[in-house]
Interface confidence: low
């Protein structure tokens, strides 16, 4: 690239001959005047490429003696107004002023866009004293300029509480287009329109944009930055980028992948974490989401039993966490479990089915036909019952628990008996005469104790009476 230095301030009055409007520091033979007495250089511009320095010369005005009141107004000399150069070049510019020697302690500060430049900047101030005046040249150099160096630079000098300000020097760093907004990756619905945005800036302006889809240009004619590309819809994944062009060349944005939303892949690795008599805790690993967030999942449960009707229970749950407690299951049953998840496009296929079993549970029904007799001759109570009738067992029956409560005036005592699973009768000793005995029976499995039967009461008289308690629950068919 060619580095340019353009002079756009008022022309120097002391240049012999016409001043060019634009000075190409790279390949133009530039004017150079000797440093004669009374003259000081006003501008030094140092390009990185070969070429002789440009030295503007400004006469320092004559002043009267130090005692005279007739001092000329102090002002910075005019210097170059506008410097245009390419990124990464070096630049040096200055401002100069002639100050009568009566003034002491003069300092020059540099400002950029209204803020003082402090610290580690390459600013050098040189003093050239003469009999009556001192020429002060403040130089400012920047190595390897960047876009952030663009701006308006001025010199300021304080004398006698007055501030003298130079004309601005505008630095314009030109380079390849710089993206301020690049297209973003997106997941889109198939055959649905969407927009991509690309914006790039110079200088130099203008910046023109070309769009590229899968390595092919989309627009024949460039669009001025910023550019919005409306894609009418895709049927398959595509990669888009944009090219930004200016006079310095071309910059290409990052390529962004536009994915087509699809139904998700089925979940994988369905696992059993915990089983109880009536619930199973499962987890799963979600499948690929099809470029669209999961909305919810469906847990499908089939009972694996030749006698079951093969119906599927469906439990809907949120997509996260990837865990669900399936409830309301039968005890001691085998189930086949699958998981499917959905996104905005639709449902995934079901995961591979896994087998799971519930554990033994407590019985769900009480024994039937509980009958209580008083066997007076033996001074005991005879209890009979029928095994609970259920279509399916909650577990292996291990026995029965008999509760008998004895109540007489002011006394109540509960006793518990356990009998084996093959029993359907039991005898208990009379605990108290002239009292009421209340009997309840529950079936017992390894999973726990089932519900107790309805209470059956029998009155135990003083010796000589007989009382008979009817069945608590009529057996089916025994009206």
């Amino acid at each position: 690239a060619i580095t340019e230095a353009r002079e756009e301030a008022k022309p120097y009055p002391l240049f012999p001959g016409p001043l060019p409007g634009s000075l190409q520091t790279d390949h133009t033979s530039l004017l150079s005047l000797p440093h004669t007495s009374g003259y000081q250089p006003a501008l030094m511009f140092s390009p990185t490429q070969p070429g002789r320095p440009y030295t503007g010369n400004v006469a320092i005005p004559r002043v009267t003696s130090a005692g005279s009141k007739l001092l000329p107004p102090l002002a910075f000399k005019h210097t170059v107004g506008h410097i245009i150069l390419s990124e990464h070049k070096d630049v040096k510019f200055n401002c100069s002023i002639s100050v009568p020697n009566i003034y002491q302690d003069t300092t020059i500060s540099w400002w950029k866009d209204g803020k003082e430049l402090l610290g580690a900047h390459h600013a050098i101030t040189q003093f050239y004293p003469d009999d009556e005046v001192t020429a002060i040249i403040a130089s400012f150099s920047i190595t390897s300029v960047q876009r952030s160096d663009n701006g308006s630079y001025i010199c300021k000098m304080k004398i006698n509480n007055e501030e003298i300000v130079s004309d601005p020097i505008y630095i314009e760093v030109q380079g390849l287009p710089h993206f301020t907004k690049q297209p973003e990756s997106m997941n889109v619905t198939r055959n649905t329109a969407f927009n991509l945005t690309c914006q790039a800036v110079g200088p130099p302006e203008p910046v023109n944009i070309f769009w590229v889809q899968n390595s092919s240009r989309v627009n024949e004619q460039p669009e001025k930055s910023p550019s919005v590309l409306t894609v009418p819809g895709l049927t398959e994944m595509a990669v888009f980028s944009c090219e930004a062009h200016n006079d310095k060349g071309l910059t290409v944005s990052k390529g962004v992948q536009i994915n087509i939303k699809a139904i998700p892949s089925p979940p994988t690795e369905v696992s059993i974490h915990n089983s109880t008599a009536h619930s199973i805790l499962i987890s799963w690993v979600p499948g690929f989401d099809g470029y669209s967030p999961f909305r919810n999942c469906s847990v499908q449960v089939k009972e694996v039993d030749p006698l079951s009707n093969g119906s599927v229970m469906i439990f809907n749950t949120s997509a996260s966490p990837h865990m669900y407690q399936i409830k309301q299951l039968q005890a001691l049953a085998n189930y086949s479990i699958g998981v499917s998840c959905m996104n905005e496009i639709g449902w995934s296929a079901v995961s591979p089915w896994i087998l799971a079993s519930t554990t033994e549970g407590a019985p769900s029904v009480a024994p039937l036909n509980v009958t209580v007799f008083l066997n007076e001759s033996r001074d005991n109570v005879d209890i009979r019952w029928m095994k609970p009738l259920t279509k399916r067992q909650a577990g292996e029956l291990v026995g029965y628990r008999i509760s008998h409560v004895w109540q007489s005036a002011g006394i109540s005592k509960e006793l518990l008996e356990e009998v084996g699973q093959n029993n359907s009768r039991a005898q208990i000793s009379v605990q108290v005469h002239n009292a009421t005995c209340t009997v309840r029976i529950a079936a017992v499995t390894k999973g726990g104790v089932g519900p107790f039967s309805d209470p059956v009461k029998i009155f135990i008289p003083a010796h000589g009476w007989v009382d008979h308690a009817p069945s608590s629950t009529p057996a089916p068919g025994n009206a």
Epitope: R190, N191, T235, E236, M237, N259, I260, A262, I263, S265, F288, G290, Y291, I345, G346, A349
Partner: antibody
């Protein structure tokens, strides 16, 4: 369950055309692409193209462009492939497959295949 | 067109043996786009592994897949008689969708 039921074997003369069918069941027909794959005896599998039943969008393998035409009838959940200007090179088993969407493209279900014999 | 090269072309193995089939792609493919099929004699191909390493529904755990970039492989941990088939790799990254030429697995 998902099923793709293809039409029976065909014996046709060189230069003629033939239309093969593939009836889908057990899923929402318009959600997935239907693909067609060719397999010649002792040779590998060759993808012919797909059709997206929801809007009829088709994508062909350049090798089969102009020789194969894909179509669907959504009311009967049936996909069709017509092959034109047949030669002995077209003698093969043709499978219809369900495509698991185009940016991961794989074929999760396959029809049983239709045997096409081109002979004079 | 992405060309998939499978090797070996044929492999004979005894029951219980470990088998590895490789598939090399002519350009880099993300693992999401790489799949394997099994075709038993006289039957349609069947999806075996999708997205490089995910087992399709009903596929025994002795099958596994791995790979990235241009190199992918299918492994049968312990060969069984029912595994006699031709195995095909497939890429879903770009059209035309392409398959490998197949690896025929025979019983020794």
């Amino acid at each position: 369950q998902v099923q793709l039921q293809q039409s029976g074997p065909e014996l046709v003369k060189p230069g003629a055309s033939v239309r093969l069918s593939c009836k889908a069941s057990g899923y929402t027909f318009t959600t997935y692409d239907i693909n067609w794959v060719k397999q010649r005896p002792g040779l590998g599998l060759e993808w012919i193209g797909w059709i997206y039943p929801r809007d009829g969008y088709t994508k062909y393998n350049e090798k089969f462009k102009g020789r194969a035409t894909l179509a669907v009838d959504t009311s009967s959940s049936t996909a069709y492939m017509e092959l034109h200007s047949l030669t002995s090179e077209d003698s093969a088993v043709y499978f219809c497959t369900r495509g698991y969407y185009d940016n991961l493209y794989y074929f999760d279900y396959w029809g049983q295949g239709t045997t096409l014999t081109v002979s004079s | 067109e992405i060309v998939l090269t499978q090797s070996p072309t044929t492999v004979a193995a005894s029951p219980g043996e470990k088998i590895t089939i490789t598939c090399s792609a002519s350009s880099i493919i993300s693992s999401n786009y790489f799949h394997w099929y099994q075709q038993r004699p006289g039957f349609s191909p069947k999806l075996l592994i999708y997205r490089t390493s995910n087992l399709a529904s009903g596929v025994p755990a002795r099958f596994s897949g791995s790979g990235s970039g241009t190199s992918y492989s299918l492994t049968i941990g312990t060969m069984e008689a029912e595994d006699v088939a031709t195995y095909y790799c497939q890429q879903g990254r770009s059209v035309p969708l392409t398959f490998g030429a197949g690896t025929k697995l025979e019983l020794k």
